[in-house]
Amino acid sequence: ATKLTEEKYELKEGQTLDVKCDYTLEKFASSQKAWQIIRDGEMPKTLACTERPSKNSHPVQVGRIILEDYHDHGLLRVRMVNLQVEDSGLYQCVIYQPPKEPHMLFDRIRLVVTKGFSGTPGSNENSTQNVYKIPPTTTKALCPLYTSPRTVTQAPPKSTADVSTPDSEINLTNVTDIIRVPVFN
């Protein structure tokens, strides 16, 4: 059975988190998608959302967050550029499907941002520069404010897969396996 799991990313200030959430494209291709942060004991907070209906590979930029929805692949790409320590937290992608509750996607992302310059530009650190070559899109669609109370959970156990290194965004080449922590079954 599919498990809702979390994956941990340890990055330095100034680096870029570059992740993807997959979804069933037949069901959700043009649905509005959102990137949320889950703070302990609080309702998930929506930070950015795609347009409604979501447009294919059309970047939407909200501050330091860029969302890009690849309809024809069932992939939502999320980039958070120029990371700050205060960006640390638990994140998730959801699909809005009013009047039903938002549909949560796999996996949750546990982001840990630490201080300190990374030295050599990281593996994808230049994507910070790349990002601003995308014409920023001001999305006219407002992100729905409601969120399912069902998604409020206790802070899940932390993953021990601290796999990134100071000079790379994510470097798994010396890791034999990833520990994915089930949040609930």
């Epitope: 799991t5 959430c21 979804y23 024809d72 069932g74 790409r77 996607l105 994808n124 994510i170 994915r180």
Partner: antibody
């Protein structure tokens, strides 16, 4: 160590379907995406698509979209790629490949490759 | 789709030579570029990821550089086992595409 072992060579007639299997070992199968890449004899590499073994979701490039199905059996850590309505130009070696990082990472670096399955389409 | 153009398509070199292969993207791909080696009858092998990072276990004579649209793959001192075909691959967006390959032959 990580291993991807694919099913054996197949000879098919035009219009038929082929299902290639890819058995993973040496890691947690549901933790990494599986991609499929093909290579016609003497030609370059062509990416076909991806599958997340945890969610079961998959996506493929336009040219294959109506003909390819990517599935998995988590109980046996096996991924499958089925290609239908075969034509002679589908004659190629088909590779299953595991990515370098988390399923959630935008990191499409093809780190671990199966040995390849030759599919020959001939009347 | 992003087109990846490798040059040259083939080259002849001798053991000990320094060899350079270039890959040009049809638009800016930042550092989202990988390099692979493929020997006849074998699966490709990842050598360099993210334009310049050496994959674990790959000899240090292999290196990669570049950003944006122009990338370079270098073998500092060619060894007999390096004669193979080399491919670049981008992942700046979907679909992922490969270069057409560079065949490296013994002179």
């Amino acid at each position: 160590q990580v291993q991807l072992v694919q099913s054996g060579a197949e000879v098919k007639k035009p219009g038929a379907s082929v299902k290639v299997s890819c058995k993973a070992s040496g890691y947690t199968f549901t933790s990494y995406d599986i991609n499929w890449v093909r290579q016609a004899t003497g030609q370059g590499l062509e990416w076909m698509g991806w599958m997340n073994p945890n969610s079961g979701n998959s996506g493929s490039v336009k040219k294959f979209r109506d003909r390819v199905t990517m599935t998995r059996d988590t109980s046996t850590s096996t991924a499958y790629m089925e290609l239908s309505s075969l034509r002679s130009e589908d004659t190629a070696v088909y590779y299953c490949v595991r990515l370098i990082g988390y399923s959630s990472a935008w990191k499409w670096s093809f780190q671990h490759w199966g040995q390849g399955t030759l599919v020959t389409v001939s009347s | 789709d992003i087109q990846m153009t490798q040059s040259p398509s083939s080259l002849s070199a001798s053991v000990g030579d320094r060899v350079t292969i270039t890959c040009q993207a049809s638009r800016d791909i930042s550092k989202y570029l990988n390099w692979y080696q493929q020997k006849p009858g074998k699966a490709p092998k990842l050598l360099i990821y993210d334009a310049s990072n050496l994959e674990t276990g790959v000899p240090s004579r292999f290196s990669g550089s570049g950003s944006g649209t122009d990338f370079t793959f270098t073998i500092s001192s060619l060894q007999p086992e390096d004669f193979a075909t080399y491919y670049c691959q981008h992942y700046d967006n979907i679909p992922i595409t490969f270069g057409q390959g560079t065949r490296l032959e013994i002179k």
